[in-house]
């Protein structure tokens, strides 16, 4: 808390600008208006403020927005964004794309903080589901955004904001999220055809039935074999041999290096080895 | 519901054989999604996987000591058994048996039975 | 083989604290990581399968992240039936390799 003191004569400010610098924290707090502020806060980012002096003007904003701070504020917040707490954030109403955007770029390049990850949530939460446009702009942001929500969570993507996925940003996605993705996947591609759709699907193949890899081994798309490997293991353990090389095409020859690890091992062992055989890789049941 | 109950020896002399069993009940060892594993924990020390056979009669041991184990299945008694030959103090431990399903990992464990190796 | 490394080795904490122990694998296991407890003279017990997936019957303070090489488990408020030991294995590779343990003890 600064201590209340009068602002000394000639001091008030009557525009937010780069003298302000050099008024100590106590002269900030008694002689910048906090209306003031609210109406130029896109000034203050210009202008280089110590720490100690954002405190100061934070609280300013604390004190005239005790419910939280109106959009037209936040907007502009810039470096000051780095000063709000979680529960500050919790307090405001932010609805505007652009106004989300602004604020992921003061914390760009750096990971994902409790204060970003209060802003999204509260961002998302507001507009009721992740529409294309917010999945767009939180994934060039956070690559991983995605995999960072609870299935829970991801049940709230529309299909058509799956488009908006690029592969990597299933990277750390782990089975139960691609359970949630792949129908929504499945729906959004439906209409490609077979090469173009298989292009678009394998990223999300983690969350793929049985039935779905028998009806991708009959088109001779050749899946290689880091997504087979991301495949889930109820999913693969009814396929044949047959069916398997079908899937995998060329690459299946790749089975013999992977065939100490999942989901390669459990279906070798639940095969015939006379089936195995047909294969010729020397994979032993 | 499946319960694991492991027999055998208590005491061992050393380059002798050690041999336990375990039952299997409530359950059947051919199981399609379950693997049959031993594990074992020497005093004040951590877990060590043994290894593991399918009811068709696969094996897959860990590699330190696959020279010197057998698992092996009995589908008609529901069993399966561990033999670990030319024992040391070194293999002194809790031996237990464990399930291992497919979608899960170790879901049920026997309680442990303890085995000395002294002459 | 692929190691697994635990962290730490023992850990001391009051009721009501949030604890988190860490398990790191020599090298890639996709979400292949379970996590077990054991008390003095019992059998472990499974608690977190496929790295985040909680085991039938275990409450929901447990809970597991990760995926790769580095693997997080959390209780979110330790209870005092919770002080045992824990630990990660993995049973991506056929050697089924587990971590040291980590102790959780009453501080």
């Known amino acids: 808390e600064v201590e209340k003191t009068a602002c000394p004569s000639g001091k008030k400010a009557r525009e937010i600008d780069e003298s302000l610098i050099f008024y100590k924290k106590w002269e900030l707090e008694a002689c910048v208006d906090a209306a003031l502020l609210a109406t130029q806060m896109d000034r203050v980012n210009a202008i280089p403020f110590t720490y100690e002096q954002l405190d100061v003007l934070k609280h300013k904003l604390d004190e005239l927005y005790p419910q939280g701070y109106p959009e037209s504020v936040i907007q502009h917040l810039g470096y000051l964004f780095l000063k709000m707490s979680p529960e500050d954030i919790r307090k405001w109403n932010v609805t505007s794309l652009e106004t989300l955007k602004a604020l992921l770029e003061v914390n760009k390049g750096h990971e994902m903080s409790p204060q970003v990850a209060t802003l999204i949530d509260r961002f998302v939460k507001g507009r009721g589901q992740l529409d294309k446009d917010t999945l767009d702009t939180l994934t060039a942001f956070y690559p991983g955004y995605l995999c960072s929500l609870s299935p829970e969570e991801l049940s709230s993507v529309p299909p058509s904001s799956i488009w908006a996925v690029r592969p990597q940003d299933l990277d750390t996605c782990d089975p139960r999220q691609l359970d949630v993705l792949y129908p929504k996947a499945r729906l959004a591609f439906q209409n490609m055809n077979g090469s173009e759709y298989f292009v678009k699907i394998q990223s999300f193949l983690g969350g793929a039935p049985t039935e779905d890899l028998k009806a991708l081994s009959q088109q001779n798309v050749s899946m290689d074999l880091a997504t087979f490997m991301k495949l889930r293991t109820d999913a693969v353990l009814p396929l044949t041999v047959a069916e398997v090389q079908k899937l995998l095409g060329p690459h299946v020859e790749g089975l013999k290096a992977e065939e100490r690890h999942r989901p390669v091992r459990d279906w070798i062992l639940r095969q015939r080895q006379d089936d195995l055989d047909t294969l010729g890789l020397g994979l032993q049941g | 519901q499946v319960q694991l109950q492991e027999s055998g020896p208590g005491l061992v002399k050393p380059s002798e054989t050690l041999s336990l069993t375990c039952t299997v009940s409530?359950?059947?060892?051919?199981?399609?999604?379950?693997?049959w594993s031993w594990i074992r924990q020497p005093p004040g020390k951590g877990l060590e996987w043994i290894g593991y056979i399918y009811y068709s009669g696969s094996t897959n041991y860990n590699p330190s000591l696959k020279s010197r184990v057998t698992i092996s299945v009995d589908t008609s008694k529901n069993q399966f058994s561990l033999k670990l030959s030319s024992v040391t103090a070194a293999d002194t431990a809790v031996y237990y048996c464990?399930?291992?399903?497919?979608?899960?990992?170790?879901?049920?464990w026997g309680q442990g039975t303890m085995v000395t190796v002294s002459s | 083989d692929i190691q697994m490394t635990q962290s730490p080795s023992s850990l001391s904490a009051s009721v009501g604290d949030r604890v988190t122990i860490t398990c790191r694998a020599s090298?890639?296991?996709?979400?292949?990581l379970n996590w077990y407890q054991q008390k003095p003279g019992k059998a472990p017990k499974l608690l977190i399968y496929a790295a985040s997936s909680l085991q039938s019957g275990v409450p929901s303070r447990f809970s597991g992240s990760g995926s790769g090489t580095d693997f997080t488990l959390t209780i979110s408020s330790l209870q005092p039936e919770d002080f045992a030991t824990y630990y990660c294995q993995q049973p991506y590779d056929a050697s089924y390799t587990f971590g040291g343990g980590t102790k959780v003890e009453i501080k």
């Open positions: 090298q890639s296991i996709s979400s292949y």
């Open positions: 464990a399930r291992d399903n497919v979608f899960t990992g170790f879901d049920i």
């Open positions: 409530g359950g059947s060892v051919s199981s399609y999604h379950d693997l």
